[in-house]
Interface confidence: low
């Protein structure tokens, strides 16, 4: 059965938007006015995985692109990457674990925890124009809280 998906944008808790930086990287920076059109639109798919009231498994694809955020080990460190997939087979209900994030809602903010690497979160830096990455700390310097904006299909 078709996976259920919605289109959205994400901003970190400092209101930085996410934009493409080269073909396989996202960066976070403040955007205003017409520049807001640069922000990436995600296709968030609700996929199979452990689920509770405040934790929902999702996959984050780039709308109308065959690219998904995925979590892999690079030099023994959990790393966030944009991975190219076969568009005929994705998205699907049973996504491989590296594509799955636990969307956790706390106080109207969202965290995205890697299902593959528990306690590692999609993160942005305090600094402007830096890559979006997978971070192993919460509540520190790096930002792990996001808000989601619904985009009509």
């Amino acid at each position: 059965a078709p996976v259920r998906s919605l289109n959205c944008t994400l901003r970190d808790s400092q209101q930085k938007s996410l934009v493409m930086s080269g073909p396989y990287e996202l960066k976070a920076l403040h955007l205003q006015g017409q520049d807001m059109e640069q922000q990436v639109v995600f296709s968030m798919s609700f996929v199979q995985g452990e689920e509770s009231n405040d934790k929902i498994p999702v996959a984050l694809g780039l709308k109308e692109k065959n690219l998904y955020l995925s979590c892999v080990l690079k030099d023994d460190k959990p790393t966030l990457q944009l991975e190219s997939v076969d568009p005929k087979n994705y998205p699907k209900k049973k996504m491989e674990k590296r594509f799955v994030f636990n969307k956790i809602e706390i106080n109207n903010k969202l965290e995205f925890e890697s299902a593959q690497f528990p306690n590692w979160y999609i993160s942005t830096s305090q600094a402007e124009n830096m890559p979006v990455f997978l971070g192993g700390t919460k509540g520190g310097q790096d930002i792990t809280d996001f808000t989601m904006q619904f985009v009509s299909s």
């Epitope: 059965a1 078709p2 259920r4 998906s5 919605l6 959205c8 609700f46 689920e51 509770s52 009231n53 929902i56 209900k93 989601m148 619904f150």
Partner: antibody, heavy 125, light 112 residues
């Protein structure tokens, strides 16, 4: 045109089993979950469970767990609901219903967009 | 367990407005969409509202749905009541915590 056509009425004795069919047409059978809902005489709607025809995955309401089996045959685009150990309280109209997923900012849900005509199952000694 | 509670029956005169509430027993009603079905005697249910407030084509705009988070309830409102509105109405939602579908007990609408 989407259609869900169910099998005819059944009369069963207590302790027996019943298998109701639901033949789908007018859409891609594997692209939509199929649910079963029943309604006892003069009572409300009661959800029983679902099948994902694509992979046969099922989810059942706790009340029916162990007594209901929902299956899908993709070669004939037909879903089935089998209820065993029948008792008089199982006398009801049984509906199959196709589900449309709806998703939005606040959450998601099921929306039953097409229903079968219903199959009356009477359990009587 | 997630439950939806509806009044057993409501009655109103033709031309008036009626509101049928549907209250969630636990969790937030806003977390998952609420649907409303109309069922006339001897017929299968048909959808009159989906996604809290959306009307399928063919359903008149005098039928509307809403969510009130403060009372943790959904409501179906029918204005300009007609005798053909007399039917049973069921609310329904999806409990994402345990992947189950829940129906309210149903409300008989009597148009006096």
């Amino acid at each position: 045109e989407v259609q869900l056509v169910q099998s005819g009425a059944e009369v069963k004795k207590p302790g027996a089993s019943v298998k109701v069919s639901c033949k789908a047409s007018g859409y891609t059978f594997t692209s939509y979950y199929m649910h079963w809902v029943r309604q006892a005489p003069g009572q409300g709607l009661e959800w029983m469970g679902l099948v994902d025809p694509e992979d046969g995955e099922t989810i059942y309401a706790e009340k029916f767990q162990g007594r209901v089996t929902i299956t899908a045959d993709t070669s004939t685009d037909t879903a089935y609901m089998e209820l065993s150990s029948l008792r008089s309280e199982d006398t009801a109209v049984y509906y199959c219903a196709r589900v449309e997923w709806v998703a939005g900012t606040e959450g998601w849900g099921y929306y039953f967009d097409y229903w079968g005509q219903g199959t009356l199952v009477t359990v009587s000694s | 367990n997630f439950m939806l509670t509806q009044p057993h029956s409501v009655s109103e005169s033709p031309g008036k407005t009626v509101t049928i509430p549907c209250t969630a027993s636990s969790g937030s009603i806003a977390n998952n969409f609420v649907q409303w079905y109309q069922q006339r005697p001897g017929s299968a249910p048909t959808t009159v509202i989906y996604e809290d407030s959306q009307r399928p084509s063919g359903v008149p705009d005098r039928v509307s749905g809403s969510i009130d988070s403060s009372s943790n309830s959904a409501s179906l409102t029918i204005s300009g009541l007609k005798t053909e509105d007399e039917a049973d109405y069921y609310c329904q939602s999806y409990d994402s915590a345990n992947d189950r579908v829940t129906f309210g007990g149903g409300t008989k609408l009597i148009v006096l």
